[in-house]
């Protein structure tokens, strides 16, 4: 089945641009002026997921790349990693489960829970140039919270 | 608050086009999407398609290939063009927002502008 | 392509009634349906997401229930104000967001 998706680049609360940091890493820093054409382009689409309240399961793709963000356990630890698909059979309706975040939207700002993992989500450090990871605390040191902005084409 | 201002709305003749402007404000159109709903005289609501980005948008499968939905960000304006318009186009076009990205559900409207397609 | 059906299409009702319109989906939708409420000359206004849950400003007399292919709006105690046409939508079918026929409430 065809899946609704867009274009967009995330910020996180502090305002601090995702770019990428090697094949497969993503960092979070602030930038401005021309570096913001650093920041990294999401493909983000609307997907199968479990029922629920009002979460919204969404896959994350890097736009024109055959990689997607993907939660697995690495030594017994939830992790982060981008991972390489093959393009002819993605984006998808029903993506695995790995690939599913749960989108929650409060007063403009995102969250992203993995379905693979609950109460997991989408994380970036205070400090600057850190790795984006995938953080098992809310409202802690480290951020879960985004801003969404689409991308003219 | 937030406000959603349809135009452009008026009398044209079958074959013909007409381009409708929806204004909004008390939110962006760069974090938002945007959908067209159109309502035929005593008829139900009938989606017409949604924008995301400019280079995403969906349409309702009839509306393919004659509606095209775009927007200028910087105006906070969103665009229906419409072309090869019939009879049965005559009808009250809303602009509307949904409510959460993906959510499908639409919590803002417009008061909704009338094009009447007659010769 | 999902088809939304709606009963009835038209219900004559008395403030204090409580009333019942039901939604069917021609395949499973899991819980991604809206109800909205419409005057005469008015847009349309959110009313119900995701199947159950009330959307802001929305008085409590309105609820909704139900999840695959069969859902219900219901006002338990009807008001002057609700007499109106409801339409509920389909959110989450892939490409098409697609809207019911429509159920008039009348005196």
């Known amino acids: 089945a065809p899946v609704r998706s867009l274009n967009c680049t995330l910020r996180d609360s502090q305002q601090k641009s995702l770019v990428m940091s090697g094949p497969y890493e993503l960092k979070a820093l602030h930038l401005q002026g021309q570096d913001m054409e650093q920041q990294v382009v999401f493909s983000m689409s609307f997907v199968q997921g479990e029922e629920s309240n009002d979460k919204i399961p969404v896959a994350l793709g890097l736009k024109e790349k055959n990689l997607y963000l993907s939660c697995v356990l690495k030594d017994d630890k939830p992790t982060l990693q981008l991972e390489s698909v093959d393009p002819k059979n993605y984006p998808k309706k029903k993506m695995e489960k790995r690939f599913v975040f749960n989108k929650i939207e409060i007063n403009n700002k995102l969250e992203f829970e993995s379905a693979q993992f609950p109460n997991w989500y989408i994380s970036t450090s205070q400090a600057e140039n850190m790795p984006v990871f995938l953080g098992g605390t809310k409202g802690g040191q480290d951020i879960t919270d985004f801003t969404m902005q689409f991308v003219s084409s | 608050e937030v406000q959603l201002v349809e135009s452009g709305g008026g009398l044209v003749q079958p074959g013909g086009s007409l381009r409708l402007s929806c204004t909004v404000s008390g939110f962006s159109l760069s974090s938002y999407a945007m959908s067209w709903v159109r309502q035929a005289p005593g008829k139900g609501l009938e989606w017409i398609g949604i924008i995301y980005d400019s280079a995403s948008t969906y349409y309702a499968s009839w509306a393919k290939g004659r509606f095209t939905i775009s927007k200028d960000t910087s105006k906070n304006t969103l665009y229906l063009q419409m072309n090869s318009l019939r009879a049965e186009d005559t009808a009250v076009y809303f602009c509307?927002?949904?409510?959460?990205?993906?959510?499908?559900?639409?919590?803002?409207w417009g008061q909704g502008t009338t094009v009447t397609v007659s010769s | 392509e999902i088809v939304m059906t709606q009963s009835p299409s038209t219900l004559s009702a008395s403030v204090g009634d409580r009333v019942i319109i039901t939604c069917r989906a021609s395949?499973?939708?899991?819980?991604?349906l809206s109800w909205y409420q419409q005057k005469p000359g008015k847009a349309p206004k959110l009313l119900i997401y995701r199947a159950s849950n009330l959307a802001s400003g929305v008085p409590s007399r309105f609820s909704g229930s139900g999840s695959g292919a069969e859902f219900t709006l219901t006002i338990s105690s009807l008001q002057p104000e609700d007499f109106a046409t409801y339409y509920c939508q389909n959110t989450g079918g892939g490409i098409n967001i697609a809207f019911g026929q429509g159920t008039k409430l009348t005196v």
């Open positions: 395949q499973s939708i899991g819980n991604w």
């Open positions: 509307a927002r949904e409510r959460q990205i993906f959510s499908g559900d639409m919590d803002g």
